[in-house]
């Protein structure tokens, strides 16, 4: 996890002191680098990256996605709604990152690093969102049954699921990074 202390952040009067903007930015870029490495192995190992049959696998997934109503795009931007969406989305991605843990051979450590770094990023963001509305945490039982279901898929679907998780997580983080730079 990359370091990055920054004590210069000052909250507006109704906010507690914030965690470091620099740490959040660096953390996201570090995770994105990790995803790139994992995508490289996935694409080298199978032809999933060129496949046109993604819709078949997407039916089994409910991956977090940014929408206009989430307030994270330039059009309709709402910083508080957006920050809640980013944290909620990352919490929802955790089960999918757990699924990735045994899906890689040469990049096993990289998969673990992405998972652990995401946990740290969530902590940073929760500090930034200290006084925002309560953030919904996914139900552990639902996550456990989803994980079992994903792991029971056939090989082709598991490969496609891996590819889709990495692609969706990358897109989610890129949107988050752009939005967080304004905050």
């Amino acid at each position: 996890v990359p370091p990055g202390e920054d004590s210069k952040d000052v909250a507006a009067p109704h906010r507690q002191p914030l965690t470091s903007s620099e740490r959040i930015d660096k953390q996201i870029r570090y995770i994105l680098d990790g995803i790139s490495a994992l995508r490289k192995e996935t694409c080298n190992k199978s032809n999933m990256c060129e496949s046109s049959k993604e819709a078949l696998a997407e039916n089994n997934l409910n991956l977090p996605k940014m929408a206009e109503k989430d307030g994270c795009f330039q059009s309709g931007f709402n910083e508080e709604t957006c920050l809640v969406k980013i944290i909620t989305g990352l919490l929802e991605f955790e089960v999918y990152l757990e699924y990735l843990q045994n899906r890689f051979e040469s990049s096993e450590e990289q998969a673990r690093a992405v998972q652990m770094s995401t946990k740290v990023l969530i902590q940073f963001l929760q500090k930034k969102a200290k006084n925002l509305d309560a953030i919904t945490t996914p139900d552990p039982t639902t996550n456990a049954s989803l994980l079992t279901k994903l792991q029971a898929q056939n090989q082709w679907l598991q490969d496609m699921t891996t590819h889709l998780i990495l692609r969706s997580f990358k897109e989610f983080l890129q949107s988050s990074l752009r939005a967080l730079r304004q905050m």
């Epitope: 909250a11 914030l18 330039q74 931007f77 910083e79 752009r178 939005a179 304004q182």
Partner: antibody, heavy 119, light 106 residues
Framework: EVQLVESGGGLVQPGGSLRLSCAAS????????MQWVRQAPGKGLEWVAK????????YYSDTVTGRFTFSLDTSKSTAYLQMNSLRAEDTAVYYC????????????WGQGTLVTVSS | DIQLTQSPSSLSASVGDRVTITCSAS?????MYWYQQKPGKAPKLLIY???NLASGVPSRFSGSGSGTDFTLTISSLQPEDFATYYC?????????FGQGTKVEIK
């Protein structure tokens, strides 16, 4: 035309207060973080402060923390810098700038307003 | 705070010359920007995130570098390019600027 226009500068005595305004036009104000940068006469640029688009988060340089307050009135597409306990070293041209969406760059700047702190 | 040192502080050049300005940071920085400022005017963004050309900026301007060492290059100096150039970094708050490089007519 996309533009920022600062106003409110002038001559003030040490210890005095001043409020600068930055009126935005030609673009949708609401998604952009805004910033203030100053330039003392004949000197280089110095970053002063940033405010997030909805005003939830503000950031200040050490030299102005506790004395300056950055605020927004989104209904008027205007940013304000309230400057208290002014010192001679605060004398400068104050520029308002827009932060480029999705980046940390400051892409649109106002023409500046001169603040002179002197007795 | 991160210190930025530009070199040279000033330079004299002729129209058509290739001009290089360097910016050295006291520690590694996350993002580097370059601005042009003319007397009595506001700064104008030229380069963002090390090497991206800002909207409307001529392609004769380019930026490069990473870590602590960065360069602004003007491939063929034009009459309107005589100005002061500043590097600026963001690696958390505060943003900091270099002291400026004045490009004058030889």
């Amino acid at each position: 035309e996309v533009q920022l226009v600062e106003s409110g500068g002038g001559l003030v005595q040490p210890g005095g207060s001043l409020r600068l305004s930055c009126a935005a036009s030609g673009f949708t104000f609401s998604p952009f973080a805004m910033q203030w940068v100053r330039q003392a006469p004949g000197k280089g640029l110095e970053w002063v402060a940033k405010i997030s688009p909805g005003g939830s988060w503000t950031y200040y340089s050490d030299t102005v923390t506790g004395r300056f307050t950055f605020s927004l009135d989104t209904s008027k597409s205007t940013a304000y810098l309230q400057m208290n306990s002014l010192r001679a070293e605060d004398t400068a041209v104050y520029y308002c700038a827009r932060q480029l969406w999705g980046y940390y760059a400051l892409d649109i700047w106002g023409q500046g307003t001169l603040v002179t702190v002197s007795s | 705070d991160i210190q930025l040192t530009q070199s040279p502080s000033s330079l004299s050049a002729s129209v058509g010359d290739r001009v290089t300005i360097t910016c050295s940071a006291s520690i590694s920085v996350s993002y580097m920007y370059w601005y042009q400022q003319k007397p009595g005017k506001a700064p104008k963004l030229l380069i963002y995130d090390m090497s991206n050309l800002a909207s409307g900026v001529p392609s004769r301007f380019s930026g490069s570098g990473s870590g602590t060492d960065f360069t602004l290059t003007i491939s063929s100096l034009q009459p309107e390019d005589f100005a002061t150039y500043y590097c600026m970094q963001w690696s958390g708050y505060p943003y900091t600027f270099g002291q400026g490089t004045k490009v004058e007519i030889k």
